[in-house]
Structure formats: structure tokens, C-alpha cells
């Protein structure tokens, strides 16, 4: 089996141009594309990785919200050769949910990394973002936190950082089959520099206050109110959005494609990757642009172009 | 129908600079990657720089590193060339070229960008 | 001196079957990197011919088919036409040069 093969971080290393080709080894039945789409209310980037994979032809298709951060994952297994490129991998510069500037700002301010490396997005190298809401939802907590794609025996993983609904929430996390989006929010000025190492503790309530040893003989004086505090992982609210569409046909035979229009042939998964039987639409992987229509996310609104190169 | 409309060639003296712009039409320019492709009088086709959809993503031939400028404007559906510093191996009609399927599937008509004394 | 190398030019009549080669190195074509192949007649702009080593896109006749394999690549134009009379160059991702590349092209002439 010949596959396509390639990495993407945000924008770059599936893009045109750079598409490989591989021969899987033995037992290998088929290709594989995954791709990953974050999008905060400053913007949106994607996660990818084609090559040649495990498990059962088929197609899944899955939204989540984190807080109000949306991701949007799909995954896609064929087993022809060079059948593994028709996910959309590009999206569109982020109208930011619609017209930023129309937006009035909230008063909380957060660091944004939408799209960058790991090395950009160290502690207070990223751009500063003035949060706003959106849709009737209020962002005025800070996130920090990764996406990570695991497909095809590669990890690929961004860090994330913007605005988010809540302002405390803890190493939360939101799961699709291979993809992970987690991490943890905080409330005030830039104060999602570094997050990895946030407690479970929330401020509401007192954390276990270690008093040290008595220094004189005297009878120890117990804290007031010292009931032992232990630390429990509220758990974790997953919304899972999942979309199935009907599958286009695709009439074209594979040596005459139209560069303009590439139809995606349906397949519905038994069991398989993720378990959904839905298949992917054209278009998704940039999920919907406008913030207002949350019950659409995600819809097509997203980048429609084969695999790069407009529509 | 896409269409790809190049401006801003002429005349201009070694050391120079001139500014090449691209309106394109008919797709969603925003998700295309872009590039610049070069052909001197009478050569062949040698690619100059490149960009991603959202313009973070950029790359440069070596010819060209450092004195040429790729950048866009989506709102605009307009891609630009900014040319300093040029030299008389810089003469050479220039093309816009949008990433399609892994390759340039649609060129514009050129501008012819001419460096002489 | 071009990445990847073609011959500079190549000639058949009218009917015949020509083909034009394209050899690279392990920093593009041999590293996995797909071709493609532009045809540029007189006076005009370049016009994607095949993609992906051997797709068409839609509106190129089947008389042309590409192929791939190791570090090189060839276009075959089969029942050649007077108006195939053309430049034609192929193109591949370069690691080393972070960037596609170009070959030299093939000045394609038809006889009679």
C-alpha cells in the first residue's frame, strides 16, 4: 500500500508541495489522515498528520467545546493507494467570530497562541489579546493548555492559549479518538503565562495550611476549623457535537480530477476508531466562522478546498 | 472563474525597488497558499517565494533572501512583492501562482520587472 | 544549473509518442516529494499538466501521463499534435532548498 505522508503544525508541513509519498510495511491495509482544528475567539489553526495507518477503513467526524474553546477532529482511513488526502487541511484566516472590532472588550486581557510553536509561546513571548464575548457567552477567563494528534505512529502537539469562559478550571480536557485538547484556565491579567503546574485547589475553597512544629513546649495549638482538605479532579465535562453528513459520490475517476471541486466518497465506521458512524462532510476541518451559531459548530463554513488552494 | 491579475513591473535602475501586487478573483483567496515564480528572458522558470493561507508561514529562495518581501492582504484578496536591493539577474517576468492540489494550478499573465543602468 | 535536470529539448511528428525525463536527487524527488509537470507554449503563462506524478487535471487530454519512480520522473505525450509544441518543465519539493524546485525545461518541437 503507497501512502500519502506528512506532518502539519498550524499552517505548515502539508502544504502544497510537500506531500510525500510512502509504502506502508507488511500488514498494513491502510492509509490513514487525521486533523485537529482549535479555534478561540482570536482565532483558529489545525493539528494534522497523514501516512499510512491501523485499524478499519472509515470516516469520524467530531466537535467539542472546551470552555468555549471549539475543536473540531476528523479522522479518515482508506484503503486504496494514496487514498489519504481528502480531509481539508487549510483554514481560513479567522474572520475573528465575525468583525473584531466591533467587539467591546471585557477587561480581561490574556496571552494567545493560536497557530504557534512551542517556542513562541513561552511564557510572556506570545501577543497579549483583549477578551470579549461572544454570542452570549462571557470570556473573561485565560487559558493555557495543548492540542495533541496522534495518527499514522506520530504525535504532533501545539500549545493553546486565549480566552475562555471559565476562570478556574483545572487540567480540563476534551477527547476525540487520537486528540486531546487540555489544560487549564485562571482569572486575571496575562495570567495564563504557565498553567502546568495548577492545582486542583480552587480559590473558593481554603487549601491545608501546614503550621510548623511548635518551637516551645507548650500544648500544640490546632488550626480553627483544620479539616483535612484533599484534593479531588472535579471531573471533566466533555460536549460532544457530532455531525454526520451525507457522503458525496465521487464521479470522478482518479486520473481526471477537477483542482476545484474534490468529492469525498462515505464511509460509516463499525466500531472502528472512534465508534461514530458519521461521515465527514467537505470542508471541515476549519469548523464554522461565526461564534453566534453555536449549534452549527461545525458546520461547513469552514475552509472548502482541496486539501489546499480555494474554492 | 479564477483569475489571478499581476501589476506594478517596470523599468527601475540596479539597487532599487519596486512592488508587485496580485488581485485574484474567483476563489477564496484566504485559503490559498501563494507564490511567486520568476522567468529571466529566455530561462526557465525558477520559484521565488511562497505563503501560507494566513501569511505566518513564509519561505524564500536563497537568490532573493533578504531583499524581497512576500505578504498579503485577504481582506483585499491581494498578494505583494516587495523588491529591494535589486540587481540585474532580478530581470525577469514575474508570475502569481496559487497552491492548489500540491502544485501551481493557476498562474497569472506576468509582469515583466526589468533592472538595467 | 537547474535542481532537477531535463533534457533541453526533444522532438516527434505528428502522431508519434514522445517522452521527457526528469532526474532529481534524495533532497526532492527521491525523498518522496511528488511531481509535477508544467506546460508553458510561446508567449503564454505556465499551465499545470499533470500533479501528484501522474493525475490530470480536468481539461488535460489523456494523451499525457506522468510517471515516477526513484529520483526520477518522466511525461509521456502520446499521439503528439502541433500543439503540443511547447516548453515543459517539471517541479518537486527540495528539502536542502526548503522549496520547490524546477527543472531546466524540455523545449518540446514538433517535425513536419
Known amino acids: 500500500l503507497e501512502c500519502y505522508s506528512c506532518v502539519q503544525k498550524a499552517d505548515d508541513g502539508c502544504s502544497p508541495h510537500r506531500m510525500k509519498t510512502v509504502k506502508c510495511g507488511p500488514g498494513v491495509d491502510v492509509c490513514t489522515e487525521a486533523v485537529g482544528a482549535v479555534e478561540t475567539i482570536h482565532g483558529q489553526f489545525s493539528v494534522a498528520v497523514r501516512g499510512c495507518g491501523s485499524g478499519i477503513p472509515g470516516k469520524n467526524d467530531r466537535g467539542l467545546d472546551l470552555h468555549g474553546l471549539l475543536a473540531f477532529f476528523q479522522l479518515q482511513q482508506c484503503s486504496e493507494d494514496r487514498c489519504n488526502a481528502k480531509l481539508n487541511l487549510t483554514l481560513r484566516g479567522l474572520n475573528p467570530a465575525g468583525n473584531e472590532s466591533a467587539y467591546e472588550p471585557n477587561g480581561a486581557e490574556c496571552y494567545s497562541c493560536v497557530g504557534l510553536s512551542r517556542e513562541k509561546c513561552q511564557g510572556s513571548m506570545p501577543p497579549v489579546v483583549n477578551c470579549y464575548n461572544a454570542s452570549g457567552r462571557v470570556y473573561k477567563g485565560c487559558f493555557d493548555g495543548n492540542v495533541t494528534l496522534t495518527a499514522a505512529n506520530v504525535t504532533v502537539s501545539l500549545p493553546v492559549r486565549g480566552c475562555v469562559q471559565d476562570e478556574t478550571c483545572t487540567r480540563d480536557g476534551v477527547t476525540g479518538p487520537g486528540f486531546t485538547l487540555s489544560g487549564s484556565c485562571c482569572q486575571g491579567p496575562r495570567c495564563n503565562a504557565d498553567l502546568r503546574n495548577k492545582t486542583y485547589f480552587s480559590p473558593r475553597i481554603p487549601p491545608l495550611v501546614l503550621l510548623p512544629p511548635p518551637t516551645t513546649a507548650a500544648p500544640s495549638t490546632r488550626a480553627q476549623n483544620s479539616s483535612s482538605t484533599t484534593s479531588t479532579a472535579a471531573p471533566t465535562t466533555t460536549t460532544s457535537i457530532i455531525k454526520p453528513t451525507t457522503a458525496q459520490a465521487s464521479h470522478t475517476s482518479p486520473h481526471e480530477m477537477d483542482l476545484e471541486v474534490i468529492q469525498e466518497e462515505g464511509a460509516s465506521l463499525s466500531g472502528g476508531a472512534a465508534g461514530h458512524g458519521g461521515t465527514a462532510g467537505h470542508g471541515g476541518a476549519a469548523g464554522h466562522q461565526d461564534r453566534s451559531n453555536m449549534e452549527k459548530y461545525p458546520g461547513k463554513g469552514g475552509a472548502q478546498i482541496p486539501a489546499k488552494g480555494g474554492s | 472563474e479564477v483569475q489571478l491579475l499581476e501589476s506594478g513591473g517596470g523599468l527601475v535602475q540596479p539597487g532599487g525597488s519596486l512592488r508587485l501586487s496580485c488581485a485574484a478573483s474567483?476563489?477564496?483567496?484566504?485559503?490559498?497558499?501563494m507564490s511567486w515564480v520568476r522567468q529571466a528572458p529566455g530561462k526557465g522558470l525558477e520559484w521565488v517565494s511562497y505563503?501560507?493561507?494566513?501569511?505566518?508561514?513564509?519561505y524564500y529562495a536563497d537568490s532573493v533572501k533578504g531583499r524581497f518581501t512576500i505578504s498579503r492582504d485577504n481582506s483585499k484578496n491581494t498578494l505583494y512583492l516587495q523588491m529591494n536591493s535589486l540587481r540585474a539577474e532580478d530581470t525577469a517576468v514575474y508570475y502569481c501562482a496559487r497552491e492548489g492540489l500540491w502544485a501551481f494550478d493557476k498562474w497569472g499573465q506576468g509582469t515583466l520587472v526589468t533592472v538595467t543602468s | 544549473q537547474s535542481v532537477l535536470t531535463q533534457p533541453p529539448s526533444a522532438s516527434g511528428t505528428p502522431g508519434q509518442r514522445v517522452t521527457i525525463s526528469c532526474t532529481g536527487s534524495s533532497s526532492n524527488i527521491g525523498a518522496g516529494y511528488v511531481v509535477h509537470w508544467y506546460q508553458q507554449l510561446p508567449g503564454t503563462a505556465p499551465k499545470l499538466l499533470i500533479y501528484?506524478?501522474?493525475k490530470r487535471p480536468s481539461g488535460v487530454p489523456d494523451r499525457f501521463s506522468g510517471s515516477k519512480s526513484g529520483t526520477s520522473a518522466s511525461l509521456a505525450i502520446s499521439g503528439l499534435r502541433s500543439e503540443d509544441e511547447a516548453d515543459y518543465y517539471c517541479a518537486a519539493w527540495d528539502d536542502r532548498l526548503n522549496g520547490p524546485v524546477f527543472g531546466g525545461g524540455t523545449k518540446l518541437t514538433v517535425l513536419g
Open positions: 501528484d506524478n501522474n
Open positions: 505563503i501560507s493561507s494566513s501569511g505566518s508561514t513564509i
Open positions: 474567483g476563489f477564496t483567496f484566504s485559503n490559498a497558499w
